[in-house]
C-alpha cells in the first residue's frame, strides 16, 4: 500500500490497492478531533519515568470507548473489503469462463496462477491492516497505563502539599506569638532609651562647658607654639646653612674623622641612610639647581627605587607638550612624570637599572626589568638606551631596545609616517609607533579594550588593551 498525506485533507489516511488494471482506494477512518495525538516534543509515550501531560479525569474512559468504536469500524470495513473482493472475483471468473472457449488451456492456467498470487497479495495487505490496528491498540493501552500512573503521582503530591500547608499554619501561629512577645520587649527598650537620652543630654551640657575651657587653654598654647615655631625655623635655617657649607667646601667635623654626609642623590641613598618606608623624599640631583621631591618605593624587590612615572586613576592629563615632559608634572604622591631633564641628570650620575610594574583590570600584576637604563640629553631628544630585558610582562621587550627618541604632541621625533604622540596621545619613546606607551589615555574598566591610544604594553596584554596602573622606577646597578 502506498500511504501518503493529502494536502487538502491532511486528517485522513488513504489505502490505495492496485489490482490488475484497476486501482481501488479505501478511505480508512482516522482519530477524530477529540483524540489527542501526542507529539515527541510534548510527551514521549515510551518514557515511563516522565510525568504524562495533565488530562481530564474521565479522559481514559473516553479513550477506551473511542477505541472500541474504532475497532468496530475497522471490523466493518474489513468485512466490506472481503465482500467486495469476493464479488469482484465472481465477475472476473465469469469473464474467464467466457474466454475459455476461445483460449488455450495454457492461458487459463496462467490466469489461474495470476489470480492466486493476487489473492495472496490481498490477504497479505489485510494482515498488514490488522497488524496496524493491533499496534494502535497496544499504544493506547500503554498511554492508559501512563495516565493512571500520572494520576497516582498527582494524588501523592496533593497529599504532600496538604501536609506542608498544615505545617505552615503551625509555624504562622508560633510567629504571631513571638511577634507579640517582641512588641512587649520593644516597649520596655524604648522606655530605657528615653531614660538614657535624658542622661546623655546632661552629659553633653557638662562636656560643652569642659570643651570651652579647653579651647581657652588651647589658644594660650597656640600663642606659645608660634613662638616655638619661629625659633625652630631659625634653627632649621642655621642647620641648612651648615649643611651647604659642609657640602660645598668639604669641611671636616671637629674630630676630623669623617666627611659630612652628602644629600641624597636618589632613593637608593635614602634607603641606605636608614629610611626604609615608601613615601615622598627630597633628593639633590647633580647639576640641577633645585632639590626634587620624588616618590621612593622601598618595598619592591629590595627597595631603593626612585619612581619616575606613575599612573593609577586617570586624575592627571598626560597629553602634554615637550616643555612639560622636560620638567615634569603631577604630584609624587599620585600620578606624575618626574621630567626628562631630571631622568637624564639622575642616570648620568651612575649606572641605573629600570623596573616597570604593571597591573591589568583583572588584577594581574607583571613587571619588566632592564639591567641598564639611561637617556640622552635634550639635544639627543632624550633618546632611550636599554640593555638586558627580563620579567613577567612578556618575553619580548615592549620598550624599543635599539634606541628611540622621545616624542610629544608638539615634537614629532618618531619613525612613523604618522604623528604617534598626537594619535596615541602622551609623550613617549615612540618608534613607529612601537609596542608600548605608558603615558597614553587612561581608560576605566570595560572601556579599556580595543583602544588605539590607551596605556599600552604590547607583550603583556596585547596592542589594544589599556592598563589599570603602571609604575616606572630606577635604582643604581650597584645597590
Amino acid at each position: 500500500s502506498n500511504q501518503r498525506r493529502s494536502p487538502e485533507n491532511s486528517g485522513r489516511r488513504y489505502n490505495r490497492i492496485q489490482h490488475g488494471q484497476c486501482a481501488y482506494t479505501f478511505i480508512l477512518p482516522e482519530h477524530d478531533g477529540n483524540c489527542r495525538e501526542s507529539t515527541t516534543d510534548q510527551y514521549n509515550t515510551n518514557a515511563l519515568q516522565r510525568d504524562a501531560p495533565h488530562v481530564e479525569p474521565d479522559f481514559s474512559s473516553q479513550k477506551l470507548q473511542h477505541l472500541e468504536h474504532v475497532m468496530e469500524n475497522y471490523t466493518q470495513w474489513l468485512q466490506k473489503l472481503e465482500n467486495y473482493i469476493v464479488e469482484n472475483m465472481k465477475s472476473e471468473m465469469a469473464q474467464i469462463q467466457q474466454n475459455a472457449v476461445q483460449n488455450h488451456t495454457a492461458t487459463m492456467l496462467e490466469i489461474g496462477t495470476s489470480l492466486l498470487s493476487q489473492t495472496a497479495e490481498q490477504t497479505r495487505k489485510l494482515t498488514d491492516v490488522e497488524t496496524q490496528v493491533l499496534n494502535q491498540t497496544s499504544r493506547l493501552e500503554i498511554q492508559l497505563l501512563e495516565n493512571s500512573l500520572s494520576t497516582y503521582k498527582l494524588e501523592k503530591q496533593l497529599l504532600q502539599q496538604t501536609n506542608e500547608i498544615l505545617k505552615i499554619h503551625e509555624k504562622n501561629s508560633l510567629l504571631e506569638h513571638k511577634i507579640l512577645e517582641m512588641e512587649g520587649k520593644h516597649k520596655e527598650e524604648l522606655d530605657t532609651l528615653k531614660e538614657e537620652k535624658e542622661n546623655l543630654q546632661g552629659l553633653v551640657t557638662r562636656q560643652t562647658y569642659i570643651i570651652q575651657e579647653l579651647e581657652k587653654q588651647l589658644n594660650r598654647a597656640t600663642t606659645n607654639n608660634s613662638v616655638l615655631q619661629k625659633q625652630q625655623l631659625e634653627l632649621m635655617d642655621t642647620v641648612h646653612n651648615l649643611v651647604n657649607l659642609c657640602t660645598k667646601e668639604g669641611v671636616l667635623l671637629k674630630g676630623g674623622k669623617r666627611e659630612e654626609e652628602k644629600p641624597f642623590r636618589d632613593c637608593a641613598d635614602v634607603y641606605q641612610a636608614g629610611f626604609n618606608k615608601s613615601g615622598i623624599y627630597t633628593i639633590y640631583i647633580n647639576n640641577m639647581p633645585e632639590p626634587k621631591k620624588v616618590f621612593c618605593n622601598m618595598d619592591v624587590n629590595g627597595g631603593g627605587w626612585t619612581v619616575i612615572q606613575h599612573r593609577e586613576d586617570g586624575s592627571l592629563d598626560f597629553q602634554r607638550g615637550w616643555k612639560e615632559y622636560k620638567m615634569g608634572f603631577g604630584n609624587p604622591s599620585g600620578e606624575y612624570w618626574l621630567g626628562n631633564e631630571f631622568i637624564f641628570a639622575i642616570t648620568s650620575q651612575r649606572q641605573y637599572m629600570l623596573r616597570i610594574e604593571l597591573m591589568d583590570w583583572e588584577g594581574n600584576r607583571a613587571y619588566s626589568q632592564y639591567d641598564r637604563f639611561h637617556i640622552g640629553n635634550e639635544k639627543q631628544n632624550y633618546r632611550l638606551y636599554l640593555k638586558g630585558h627580563t620579567g613577567t610582562a612578556g618575553k619580548q621587550s615592549s620598550l624599543i631596545l635599539h634606541g628611540a627618541d622621545f616624542s610629544t604632541k608638539d615634537a614629532d621625533n618618531d619613525n612613523c609616517m604618522c604623528k604617534c604622540a598626537l594619535m596615541l596621545t602622551g609623550g613617549w619613546w615612540f618608534d613607529a609607533c612601537g609596542p608600548s606607551n605608558l603615558n597614553g589615555m587612561f581608560y576605566t574598566a570595560g572601556q579599556n579594550h580595543g583602544k588605539l591610544n590607551g596605556i599600552k604594553w604590547h607583550y603583556f596584554k596585547g596592542p589594544s588593551y589599556s592598563l589599570r596602573s603602571t609604575t616606572m622606577m630606577i635604582r643604581p646597578l650597584d645597590f
Epitope: 609616517m417 604618522c418 594619535m423 613607529a432 612601537g434 609596542p435 580595543g450 588605539l452 596592542p463 589594544s464
Partner: antibody, heavy 122, light 112 residues
C-alpha cells in the same frame, strides 16, 4: 634607514611556483603586521594577504586562497609569499606593505616595498 | 566585502586650483573605538603608493598641508587646496575597518 626591500619576481609558466621575499630594516619588524598587495598592469590596487606580528593570524583574499602562503621570520626580519599553481590572472606588481601602527586593526600602510613584477605566461 | 566607490575617476585640474575626490563605502567605517579606518594613498607614475591621510583625517608625516581628509561613516573626501604639478598620479581610498581591506578604483589626477 626604515625600508622594505623586495626580491623574487620574474616570468613563470602557468601552474608553476614562485617565492617572493621582503627584507625589513630600521624598525622593530616583530611588532608589526605585514601585508602583500598587488596591482595588475594598468589596474588598481588589490589586497592579497596579511600576517600578524607574531605570525599567529593569517588572512588571504578569496582569489588566492589555497594557492598562496604568507609567512615571516622575525629573527631574519623577513616576509615571504609562496605562490603555487600560478595563473595568468596573477600577473601583477606585488608590493609588501607594513601596518602603519602596532595594532590589531589595519590603520593603513605606513611603508611600502618597491614592488616586484610577477608575469605568468606560457 | 566592503565596496569602495570613488568619484570622479578622472580629474583634470589647473595648477593653483583646488581639487576634491569623494569616496563612499557600502558600510559604515566608524569603528566601535571611535575611529574611521580610512586612508588615502597617492601613487605617482612608476612609483609605489604613498600614504597621504590615515584614520580619515590625519595627515601623514611629510605630506604638505594643502592635503586634507574629512568625513565619517560612509562618506569621505580628500581635498587639495591648491594643486601643484607634483600632485599628478592616481589617488586611492582604502578601508581597514572590516576584513578584507578594500581599495577604491582610483582617481587619476592630471594637469590641464
Amino acid at each position: 634607514e626604515v625600508q622594505l626591500v623586495q626580491s623574487g619576481g620574474g616570468v613563470v609558466q602557468p601552474g608553476r611556483s614562485l617565492r617572493l621575499s621582503c627584507a625589513a630594516s630600521g624598525f622593530t619588524f616583530s611588532s608589526y603586521g605585514m601585508h602583500w598587495v598587488r596591482q595588475a598592469p594598468g589596474k588598481g590596487l588589490e589586497w592579497v594577504s596579511y600576517i600578524s606580528s607574531s605570525g599567529s593570524t593569517i588572512y588571504y583574499a578569496d582569489s588566492v586562497k589555497g594557492r598562496f602562503t604568507i609567512s615571516r621570520d622575525n629573527a631574519k626580519n623577513s616576509l615571504y609569499l609562496q605562490m603555487n599553481s600560478l595563473r595568468a590572472e596573477d600577473t601583477a606588481v606585488y608590493y609588501c606593505a607594513r601596518d602603519l601602527l602596532d595594532y590589531d586593526i589595519l590603520t593603513g600602510y605606513g611603508m611600502w616595498g618597491q614592488g616586484t613584477l610577477v608575469t605568468v605566461s606560457s | 566585502d566592503i565596496v569602495m566607490t570613488q568619484s570622479p575617476l578622472s580629474l583634470p585640474v589647473t595648477p593653483g586650483e583646488p581639487a576634491s575626490i569623494s569616496c563612499r563605502s557600502s558600510q559604515s567605517l566608524l569603528h566601535s573605538n571611535g575611529y574611521n579606518f580610512l586612508d588615502w594613498y597617492l601613487q605617482k607614475p612608476g612609483q609605489s603608493p604613498q600614504l597621504l591621510i590615515y584614520l580619515g583625517s590625519n595627515r601623514a608625516s611629510g605630506v604638505p598641508d594643502r592635503f586634507s581628509g574629512s568625513g565619517s561613516g560612509t562618506d569621505f573626501t580628500l581635498k587639495i587646496s591648491r594643486v601643484e604639478a607634483e600632485d599628478v598620479g592616481v589617488y586611492y581610498c582604502m578601508q581597514g575597518t572590516h576584513w578584507p581591506p578594500t581599495f577604491g578604483q582610483g582617481t587619476k589626477l592630471e594637469i590641464k
